[in-house]
């Protein structure tokens, strides 16, 4: 019962066929983040809306406790945008002792957690120095790429400073994944 | 005639199978925007090239009058990049009465219009304050995510200021969607 | 033996079906760039890791000599992020003779090379003026879109200044493509 087709010049046997509408998929949208303790030197994870408005999970892709749970092994396209906003950054202040300041920055990391593996894996990182003078600032960081994931892997989005995340609109800050 | 395959441990019936090459797809590229009147407090929509150069529409995905028309229901990945360019921004000017200036900004919105629904839905937004001193500036905003769309839905790209869009090259400003 | 399915109201014949797991795919990650000569007025191409860590190529998608080689014709989603980093840009310095400075900038181009065609085709470009004062700076440029490619086409990523590319982490700078 394996799917068969004619390749350009010969018959070829492929892996079992699969209807696209049945594949695990999720698009999560921002909600206001409740302040929580997080470990020093570890970026906090965002939590997400998974069923209201534009958000959804389908075909066994589940969201629980800040994680997207991967229900089957395969190649997934994973993406996120986080919009940050803040007040004037100090990066252009006069430098002490001739050294440039360490700039303010904003960072988004999409992280994979595998229970059988002790350390999380950083899949994608977007990081940007922020040097805005004289006004409030706001800007997005977008990430997206394809990764081979295993059933049971968990995905989360971590940010450098949860208090700078713009949680006001579901179209500004979001996180998604789909099996290819 | 439903598509069948062996799941890891049991036979499973899926939705009808579908050849990937037959799915609705479009990649549209920038053209110069002719100045046109638009409603106050409403971001103007960009119009696009749909058949020359890198641009194409296929498999019943049609482009007409600034809209991509969705020909069948399903989950689509939708993306756009808009490159903006302008001259020195005023955001670093001395602030009156100790208040920061309202910064200049650039915004891209991918919008869904459903005829049976009175209000357009903002699917994706990228918005960025612009604070550049001493020179002309240019920068892209990229957006992309997956959404469940219905047959007949229409997609457009709106921008905060059409006069700042870099229309010079098809690889700088573009808009696309494809059925997953 | 063509793939068949029931359309909503009538039987329709599609192109041959294809198992998704069999499609050409690649995700390449950054490695340190060895300085090489490149032609004046031509952006240098990055080279990539293709098998260690998060990087992979599969199903006849091969990487060789800075190029991804497209093994079969079809519509591909292509993406890349390049993180740049540098020291203070001079764009806000006092301008000589009242003229604005030409701004510093960073640019990423995803380029297609077709052996039968004399000129490379720029598929995607992300370009950004850099005007940071008082500190070191870093920032990503992300690109992604869908293109119709032919068997034998080659893809590469070019950058405006190879010495500004952040090669330190595989999640910061990457390049990928997959057949839809």
């Amino acid at each position: 019962l394996k799917g068969q087709e004619f390749a350009p010049s010969h018959q070829q046997v492929y892996a079992p066929l699969r209807a696209d509408g049945d594949k695990p998929r999720a698009h999560l949208t921002v909600v206001r983040q409740t302040p929580t303790q997080h470990f020093k030197n570890q970026f906090p994870a965002l939590h997400w809306e998974h069923e209201l408005g534009l958000a959804f999970t389908k075909n066994r892709m589940n969201y629980t406790n800040k994680f997207l749970l991967i229900p089957e092994s395969g190649d997934y396209f994973i993406y996120s945008q986080v919009t940050f906003r803040g007040m004037t950054s100090e990066c252009s202040e006069i430098r002490q002792a001739g050294r440039p300041n360490k700039p303010d920055s904003i960072t988004v990391v999409i992280t994979k957690v595998t229970d059988s593996y002790p350390e999380p894996t950083q899949l994608l990182m977007g990081t940007k120095s922020v040097c805005e003078v004289g006004s409030n600032w706001f800007q997005p960081i977008y990430l997206g790429a394809m990764f081979s994931l295993q059933e049971g892997d968990k995905l989360m989005v971590n940010v450098s400073d949860i208090s700078l995340v713009d949680y006001t609109k579901e179209d500004k800050t979001f996180f998604g994944a789909f099996l290819l | 005639l439903k598509g069948q395959e062996f799941a890891p441990s049991h036979q499973q019936v899926y939705a009808p199978l579908r050849a990937d090459g037959d799915k609705p797809r479009a990649h549209l590229t920038v053209v110069r925007q002719t100045p046109t009147q638009h409603f106050k407090n409403q971001f103007p929509a960009l119009h696009w090239e749909h058949e020359l150069g890198l641009a194409f529409t296929k498999n019943r995905m049609n482009y007409t009058n600034k809209f991509l028309l969705i020909p069948e229901s399903g989950d689509y990945f939708i993306y756009s990049q808009v490159t903006f360019r302008g001259m020195t921004s005023e955001c670093s000017e001395i602030r009156q009465a100790g208040r920061p200036n309202k910064p200049d900004s650039i915004t891209v919105v991918i919008t869904k219009v459903t005829d049976s629904y009175p209000e357009p839905t903002q699917l994706l937004m990228g918005t960025k304050s612009v604070c550049e001193v001493g020179s002309n500036w240019f920068q892209p905003i990229y957006l992309g995510a997956m959404f469940s769309l219905q047959e007949g839905d229409k997609l457009m790209v709106n921008v905060s200021d059409i006069s700042l869009v870099d229309y010079t090259k098809e690889d700088k400003t573009f808009f696309g969607a494809f059925l997953l | 033996l063509k793939g068949q399915e029931f359309a909503p109201s009538h039987q329709q014949v599609y192109a041959p079906l294809r198992a998704d797991g069999d499609k050409p795919r690649a995700h390449l990650t950054v490695v340190r760039q060895t300085p090489t000569q490149h032609f004046k007025n031509q952006f240098p191409a990055l080279h990539w890791e293709h098998e260690l860590g998060l990087a992979f190529t599969k199903n006849r998608m091969n990487y060789t000599n800075k190029f991804l080689l497209i093994p079969e014709s079809g519509d591909y989603f292509i993406y890349s992020q390049v993180t740049f980093r540098g020291m203070t840009s001079e764009c806000s310095e006092i301008r000589q003779a009242g003229r604005p400075n030409k701004p510093d900038s960073i640019t990423v181009v995803i380029t297609k090379v077709t052996d039968s065609y004399p000129e490379p085709t720029q598929l995607l470009m992300g370009t950004k003026s850099v005007c940071e004062v008082g500190s070191n700076w870093f920032q990503p440029i992300y690109l992604g879109a869908m293109f119709s490619l032919q068997e034998g086409d080659k893809l590469m990523v070019n950058v405006s200044d190879i010495s500004l590319v952040d090669y330190t982490k595989e999640d910061k700078t990457f390049f990928g493509a997959f057949l839809l």
Epitope: - | R32, P35, Q37, R85, Y167, T168 | -
Partner: antibody, heavy 117, light 107 residues
């Protein structure tokens, strides 16, 4: 630095065709539209039309039937032809760079064209 | 076509004084309005675009305001080199059009 330089005859006879060229230097020619604007003596400015490196043009409808703007990317120059001229076409003709979009941030110094027999 | 009407035709002021120039459009042009300065025998120079954004290299004494149909160019304190003719230009609809100009002269 970006420079624009108009050239062409300063005197044209009525009913003939006015021809001007603008040479551009100091910038990537393909990244912009390039425009022609004119100014009759002692009067205001009038937009004539513009072009990009692919030859796409926009014209003022009031002049469209008589205007042709063309481009030569190999020489970094673009040209204006205005046919069937009359005394009303006497003006200083400027070429200019369109940046960011329908705004003119760099101009040539202008060349006076007089239509007279 | 959209008509732009500038007022006054001539403005007589002394150095150090504040100049306020008006431009009115025959229909809304949103914020798609630019201001230029032109001195005798010279090409126009872009001052303001987007109704209120200063062009690169333009001194802070020049500012623009307005939206829709009514726009203002303000020179906060006139310098000797500011005495010139000023034009507004709309780019909300084709064809692009200019106002007839306001001359700022020394009193």
């Amino acid at each position: 630095e970006l420079q624009l330089q108009e050239s062409g005859p300063g005197l044209v006879k009525p009913s003939e065709t006015l021809s001007l060229t603008c040479a551009v230097s100091g910038v990537s020619f393909t990244d912009y539209h390039w425009a022609w604007i004119r100014q009759p003596p002692g009067k205001g400015l009038e937009w004539i039309g513009d072009i990009n490196h692919r030859g796409h043009t926009n014209y003022n409808p009031s002049l469209k039937s008589r205007v042709t703007v063309s481009i030569d990317t190999s020489k970094n120059q673009f040209s204006l032809k205005l046919s069937s001229v009359t005394a009303a076409d006497t003006a200083v003709y400027y070429c200019a760079r369109d940046y960011p979009n329908f705004i003119y941030d760099y101009w040539g110094q202008g060349t006076l064209v007089t239509v007279s027999s | 076509d959209i008509q732009l009407t500038q007022s006054p035709g001539t403005l007589s002021l002394s150095p150090g004084e504040r100049a306020t120039l008006s431009c009115r459009a025959s229909q809304s042009v949103s914020n798609y309005l630019a201001w230029y300065q032109q001195k005798p025998g010279q090409a126009p120079r872009l001052l303001i675009y987007g109704a209120s954004r200063r062009a690169t290299g333009i001194p802070a004494r020049f500012s623009g305001s307005g939206s829709g149909t009514d726009f203002t160019l303000t020179i906060s304190s006139l310098e000797p080199e500011d005495f010139a003719v000023y034009y507004c230009q709309q780019y909300a609809a084709s064809p692009l059009t200019f106002g007839q100009g306001t001359k700022v002269e020394i009193k």
